[in-house]
């Protein structure tokens, strides 16, 4: 069967029919429905929402919709023993306490089960000691403190501002520096955009607002007690002491009103430079400890949260493919939220809901996609990508053989300025071609394409006339599919103007103020940006599931491989003497990249010319495209990170949110000048070059003619 026989709608009309069926008003309605009460992972409310989504997806017309449950480690505050931080005097009396909860937003005062701000998976403890301010708690911040300023964090409680990097990396860095507790806070410099009012009068963070979030360092493991395997009914669970990624010191988040009280008394060293100063009216002294008059006062943390094995529920919907039912295109986003989830995740879940409804409408009219589409509503993303990872672990054999692509669908918006896309290079051309066919929602771009407004507002740093597309990092549910399984992945959302807004994420991220009203009043009153994101995500899924030849261009991988090889070579060349001494050569890598480029070019030529009416040859060529991403997987994984197996991309070891290219080589080179055994260190660099070169060459050969 050709894919045309799978439908009674003409092929050109297919995509248009799908896109035309998507309605902004429906997305708005779904968002409202999903945000009226909290949907914290592991709670009854989130289970009920899972069942509601299951029921509605069935009504929309999917072939089957099932719940997939797992019993995973989650973390909750103690309801009767709240977490807080105190300033104590020399007698041990608490003279100041941080707030126990955020002031609820207007209209939500009587909502029950709003979880107070906490750092998920913090151990219990009541450490007390002097405070040290560590800026963003990045690797370079601790280098500055320890190496340049000679400040020792051992036995201290550190206070770090949120932003720049994933909070779990901050905690890991603090632990390695010997800290005995971590206080995380939102500084107005990062979470209060100038000229905008704080919620409920605008989209800025009020002083009592606090960012929740997990502080794990899972490195792709999923449930901390069952790494590598699903947390099912017969799972063998590790003891808590052997659990993956748990922090070893107490951690707690606060807002900037409370942070002001802690930071205004700081003494010790002055901040090293202006990059360590935020926007509070405090000196931003580093410490340790409080200034003269207050030097006998200490900070004490009171953390009583508990880790509990709890049941979570994914919703998995299937729309069976008419021609290649054993090829899966997956659209997934999470359902669990910290509180109301006005942006994260429900702005994404509402878009997924409308995409399912549109696909269902076409199916009811007799249409089917060529390939199977799987839709997923993931649970416990906020607790470490647990729902998606457990499901992928359970279904890994199917996914590695049948997985064509994964499109992520968390928050649809983090601003309303322009499009933001992170994806595998295989999807660059798909994204370019699709956005050229979509209308821009932006003011001043009426009648212009999305591609045009996106390119104008977010130009590629390398190629003129093209938009910026970023590397995939982590911190979301695509991680297991891309970094562990090597399934081509992508994500798209509307974002802010990074040029003028230097704050991290959006100000109300993971706070109680992330409500429906935040979106409806301040971000997207017409839901036109949500609709555009639905068109991009849905359009990508449609093309991936329905095009006869998979819309992947392997030549774009060749281009970035050369760019990444150049970049890592230039990093290494900062040490020319050592490269000479230890005979470090990148020739094998550049040779492999050259071979990849030539083979990809020839493959693309064959792709233009082959007989698409021959189903065997078509399937063969498509399989070569599908398995190309898989070919970049090293079964042994990266050093000390066995679940990060992609040799070209991994989450940065210093910031989970960011993607790093040739991560094995990059990590081997990082801070190499400080290594105690240079010979061993440069030996590891050489080994990583070897692994990378071999992998690129092996991947290239999967594109060669099969015989």
């Amino acid at each position: 069967k050709s894919s045309n026989e799978a439908t009674n709608i003409t092929p050109k009309h297919n995509m248009k029919a799908f896109l035309d069926e998507l309605k902004a008003e429906n997305i708005k309605k779904f968002l409202y429905n999903f945000t009226q009460i909290p949907h914290l992972a592991g709670t009854e409310q989130n289970f009920q929402l899972a069942k509601q989504i299951q029921s509605q997806w069935k009504e929309f017309g999917l072939d089957s919709v099932e719940l997939a449950h797992y019993d995973v480690l989650l973390s909750y505050p103690n309801k009767t023993h709240p977490n807080y931080i105190s300033i104590i005097n020399e007698d041990g009396n608490e003279i100041f306490n941080t707030s126990l909860f955020e002031p609820p937003p207007p209209g939500y005062e009587n909502v029950s089960d709003i979880v107070p701000p906490f750092s998920a998976f913090s151990p219990q403890g009541m450490p007390e000691g002097d405070l040290v301010y560590v800026n963003y708690a990045r690797t370079e911040d601790f280098f500055k403190l320890e190496r340049d300023m000679k400040i020792n964090c051992s036995g201290k409680i550190v206070i770090a501002r949120y932003g720049k990097v994933f909070r779990g990396n901050k905690v890991k860095n603090a632990q390695l520096a010997g800290a005995k507790g971590v206080i995380l806070y939102s500084d107005p410099a990062d979470y209060f955009a100038p000229g905008v009012k704080s919620y409920p009068d605008g989209w800025n963070l009020p002083g009592g607002g606090v960012q929740r979030g997990n502080i794990l360092n899972l490195n792709g493991a999923g449930d901390p007690l069952t790494p590598g395997y699903p947390a099912n009914e017969y799972a063998y669970r590790r003891g808590i002491a052997e659990a993956v990624g748990l922090p070893s010191i107490p951690v707690h988040p606060i807002g900037y009103y409370d942070a002001q009280k802690l930071l205004e008394k700081m003494g010790g060293s002055a901040p090293p430079d202006s990059s360590w100063r935020g926007s509070l009216k405090v000196p931003y002294n580093v410490g340790p400890g409080f200034t003269g008059n207050f030097s006998t006062q200490k900070v004490k943390m009171h953390i009583h949260s508990t880790n509990e094995v709890t049941r979570i529920y994914n919703v998995i919907g299937t729309l069976r493919g008419a021609v290649e039912p054993d090829r899966y295109v997956i659209l997934g986003g999470h359902r669990d939220s910290w509180v109301f989830g006005g942006i994260d995740p429900q702005s994404g879940a509402a878009v997924v809901h409308e995409i399912v409804r549109s696909f269902g409408t076409l199916k009811k009219e007799g249409w089917r996609p060529r390939r199977t589409i799987l839709f997923a509503s993931w649970d416990a993303e906020e607790f470490g990508l647990l729902g998606s990872t457990e499901w992928a672990e359970e279904n890994s054999r199917l996914l590695q053989e049948r997985g064509v692509a994964y499109i992520n669908a968390d928050s649809s918006i983090e601003g309303n300025y322009t499009l933001r896309v992170d994806c595998t290079p295989l999807m660059y051309s798909l994204v370019h071609n699709l956005t050229k066919e979509l209308k821009s929602p932006d003011e001043g771009f009426e009648g212009k394409s999305l591609y045009e407004s996106w390119t104008k507002k977010s130009p590629s740093p390398e190629f003129s006339g093209m938009p910026r597309i970023s590397k995939l990092g982590s911190g979301n549910d695509f991680e297991v599919f891309f970094q562990r399984l090597g399934i081509a992945s992508g994500r798209a959302r509307y974002t802010k103007n990074w040029e003028t807004n230097k704050f991290s994420g959006y100000p109300l991220y993971h706070s109680v103020y992330e409500t429906y009203e935040l979106v409806e009043k301040f971000y997207d009153p017409m839901f036109k940006y949500h609709l555009t994101v639905a068109q991009v995500r849905g359009g990508m899924v449609f093309e991936l599931a329905n095009s006869i030849v998979l819309p992947f261009d392997c030549r774009d991988y060749a281009v970035v491989l050369r760019k990444y090889a150049d970049k890592i070579y230039s990093i290494s060349m900062k040490h020319p003497q050592e490269m000479k001494t230890y005979s470090v050569s990148f020739d094998s890598l550049f040779s492999a990249v050259k071979n990849f480029t030539e083979i990809a070019s020839k493959f693309s030529e064959r792709l233009q010319d082959f007989d698409k009416s021959n189903p065997i040859v078509l399937r063969m060529m498509n399989d070569q495209l599908m398995f190309l991403e898989r070919a970049f997987i090293d079964p042994l994984g990266l050093p000390d990170r066995p679940f990060y197996r992609h040799v070209i991309y991994a989450p940065s070891s210093h910031n989970k949110y960011a993607g790093e290219s040739f991560p094995g080589i990059y990590d081997a080179l990082f801070d190499i000048e400080s290594k105690v055994d240079p010979s061993k260190a440069w030996g590891e660099v050489k080994r990583q070059i070897y692994v990378a070169a071999f992998t690129v060459q092996a991947a290239a050969e999967t594109l060669s003619e099969v015989a």
Partner: nanobody
Framework: QVQLVESGGGVVQPGRSLRLSCVAS????????MHWVRQAPGKGREWVAV????????YYADSVKGRFTISRDNSKNTLYLQMNSLRPEDTAVYYC????????????????WGQGTTVTVSS
């Protein structure tokens, strides 16, 4: 409409106790710091105590420290002032007052006042 209604005042002998209440309506009580302020006959207003919106912090004027306790029940939209070891100089009209900005504590930034309740300490 927005209002604060105090009650619990009365005449009491020195050394005895009294508990004042203030019921709030028309605004989200749970989101605002609350104060007690008093005005003795023929004198200006004197700040007595403040409690944060969530009850995590309470501060007192030196003149009442150790004798008065401010508390709140957010589920009942009610503010309390427990006054022990009363003295003649505690005689005053006691007002509750609401912070103007939600989630913050200030010494004197109030936007709503009650009508007051009179406390007389006399033997």
């Amino acid at each position: 409409q927005v209002q604060l209604v105090e009650s619990g005042g009365g005449v009491v002998q020195p050394g005895r106790s009294l508990r004042l209440s203030c019921v709030a309506s028309g605004f989200p009580f749970i989101s605002y710091g609350m104060h007690w302020v008093r005005q003795a006959p023929g004198k200006g207003r004197e700040w007595v105590a403040v409690i944060s919106y969530d009850g995590s912090n309470r501060y007192y004027a030196d003149s009442v420290k150790g004798r008065f306790t401010i508390s709140r029940d957010n589920s009942k939209n009610t503010l309390y002032l427990q006054m022990n070891s009363l003295r003649p100089e505690d005689t005053a009209v006691y007002y509750c007052a609401k912070e103007r900005i939600f989630g913050v504590l200030t010494p004197d930034d109030f936007d709503i006042w009650g009508q007051g309740t009179t406390v007389t300490v006399s033997s």
